[in-house]
Amino acid sequence: EEELQVIQPDKSVLVAAGETATLRCTATSLIPVGPIQWFRGAGPGRELIYNQKEGHFPRVTTVSDLTKRNNMDFSIRIGNITPADAGTYYCVKFRKGSPDDVEFKSGAGTELSVRAKPSAPVVSGPAARATPQHTVSFTCESHGFSPRDITLKWFKNGNELSDFQTNVDPVGESVSYSIHSTAKVVLTREDVHSQVICEVAHVTLQGDPLRGTANLSETIRVPPTLEVTQQPVRAENQVNVTCQVRKFYPQRLQLTWLENGNVSRTETASTVTENKDGTYNWMSWLLVNVSAHRDDVKLTCQVEHDGQPAVSKSHDLKVSAHPKEQGSNTAAENTGSNERNIY
């Protein structure tokens, strides 16, 4: 029969970060006389966790089960557990010696594993906007979780994406881990209202995954389509020419009217109308006075959208006694109209 047994009944203990870990240890005897100390790790580099007699261990409290007649309780509690506390803890009996105590017997060790929640996933998109039909990359990052097993999924408007690559670091053992994933998304013209979602599932989240989102409105640029039309005569020698700028996003847009290549007027889109898909429409017009001698005016609507190279649409001004009606005349009602006289 052994002189003394040091019993650590728990091979492993799993604790959530922020909680308290109880590390159990009993000894069958006080003899041989000498202290019991707790260490993390084994060998010369082991870390002293608790020594009853000396030292300051603010996170450690003792736990005594006084009801057990046949052994001594040397269990401890460690408060406010973090992933850095993970490791194997040993309850070690020393025998009093001179000048130093001698290690007599160690418990089998208790492996403390810390369950730490992943941080909220952060999704980031490309630095520059891209147009429909282009493929853009989104990244998702989450940190500080343990254990290593984790599941990450990507969604676009609720539909799961398949084109992504995920890494969990580090590859080897660590107190906590990070996940990094990159997803490829093909943009469509309807994506202004779309969302890309990164969803992270981990044992600590109890079936309630964390989500990070990115709005494609921050990523997409939908270039406008232009249409220039000549409206009916409003008054003697007056022609209304409109430039309809349709289906663009974002709103930042500047329009310039050119007459025979010369700048006539520049304006910035202000009172726009929003389409159901999140894109915008805008209309600008020019009131032109024409004389019988001037029917060869080339009017150009030039649009610079979101800092991109300008696109333009031209219209040869048709002047006759009774010009044919083209398009809508609603623009003529707009008080924001501008008049340009041509002699």
Epitope: E1, E2, E3, L4, T28, S29, L30, I31, P32, V33, G34, P35, I36, Q52, T61, T62, V63, S64, L66, R69, N70, N71, M72, D73, F74, S75, I76, R95, K96
Partner: antibody
Framework: EVQLVESGGGLVKPGGSLRLSCAAS????????MSWVRQTPGKGLEWVAT????????YYPDSVKGRFTLSRDNAKNSLYLQMNSLRAEDTAVYYC???????????WGQGTTVTVSS | DIVLTQSPASLAVSLGERATISCRAS??????????MHWYQQKPGQPPKLLIY???NLESGVPDRFSGSGSRTDFTLTINPLQAEDVATYYC??????????FGGGTKVEIK
């Protein structure tokens, strides 16, 4: 029923020797730390010696260290205290006591009286 | 050495009343939250008998009118209510991991 029966006490001259024995029964002797505690009318109870369950480790207070030797024979369920160089102040009733955990004294024998006198 | 001071040295209490005995240690006898202080009863002509182990645990077969409390350096044995058969001398004893183990001087309890 646990029983501890001491023997070997008696009258001895100062400087003399005595060997006390304790016969144990009714429990697993080899699992217990065993001790001797003495009681004098003047000094009350005094711990004298302790031996580990396997017999490897022995402990004594300074008052008897070097003069008393504690041993055990687990095969015979017996505990022995060899007392040499006895002094008048060693006069006392000597109790054999068991300690399951090397802590509190669970069971005590009836005691044997040692008188050191010229 | 850890010195145990028991008080009072003697105590006379009426039957059915509470008897309280104090034991003060010169330094803490606690290890890992356990107080290694024990109480024994000794009647004339008999060996001591364990009543309370590790400050507050009642030894098997001991009546529950005996109770122990305290930690670190201050401990109390209470007998409530006192019965005629409780007339005896009571000793405290510390068995911390600092040798030598020591006993208190004893408290003699009598019936008033």
């Amino acid at each position: 029923e646990v029983q501890l029966v001491e023997s070997g006490g008696g009258l001895v001259k100062p400087g003399g020797s005595l060997r006390l024995s304790c016969a144990a029964s009714g429990f697993t002797f080899s699992s217990y730390v065993m001790s001797w505690v003495r009681q004098t009318p003047g000094k009350g109870l005094e711990w004298v010696a302790t031996i580990s369950s396997g017999g490897t480790y022995t402990y004594y207070p300074d008052s008897v260290k070097g003069r008393f030797t504690l041993s055990r024979d687990n095969a015979k369920n017996s505990l022995y205290l060899q007392m040499n160089s006895l002094r008048a102040e060693d006069t006392a009733v000597y109790y054999c006591a068991s300690q399951l955990t090397g802590s509190e004294f669970d069971y005590w024998g009836q005691g044997t009286t040692v008188t050191v006198s010229s | 050495d850890i010195v145990l001071t028991q008080s009072p040295a003697s105590l006379a209490v009426s039957l059915g009343e509470r008897a309280t005995i104090s034991c003060r240690a010169s330094e803490s006898v606690d290890l890992y939250g356990t107080s290694f202080m024990h109480w024994y009863q000794q009647k004339p002509g008999q060996p001591p008998k364990l009543l309370i182990y590790r400050a507050s645990n009642l030894e098997s077969g001991v009546p529950d009118r005996f109770s122990g409390s305290g930690s670190r350096t201050d401990f109390t044995l209470t007998i409530n209510p006192l019965q005629a058969e409780d007339v005896a001398t009571y000793y405290c004893h510390q068995s911390s991991d600092e040798l030598p183990w020591t006993f208190g001087g004893g408290t003699k309890v009598e019936i008033k």
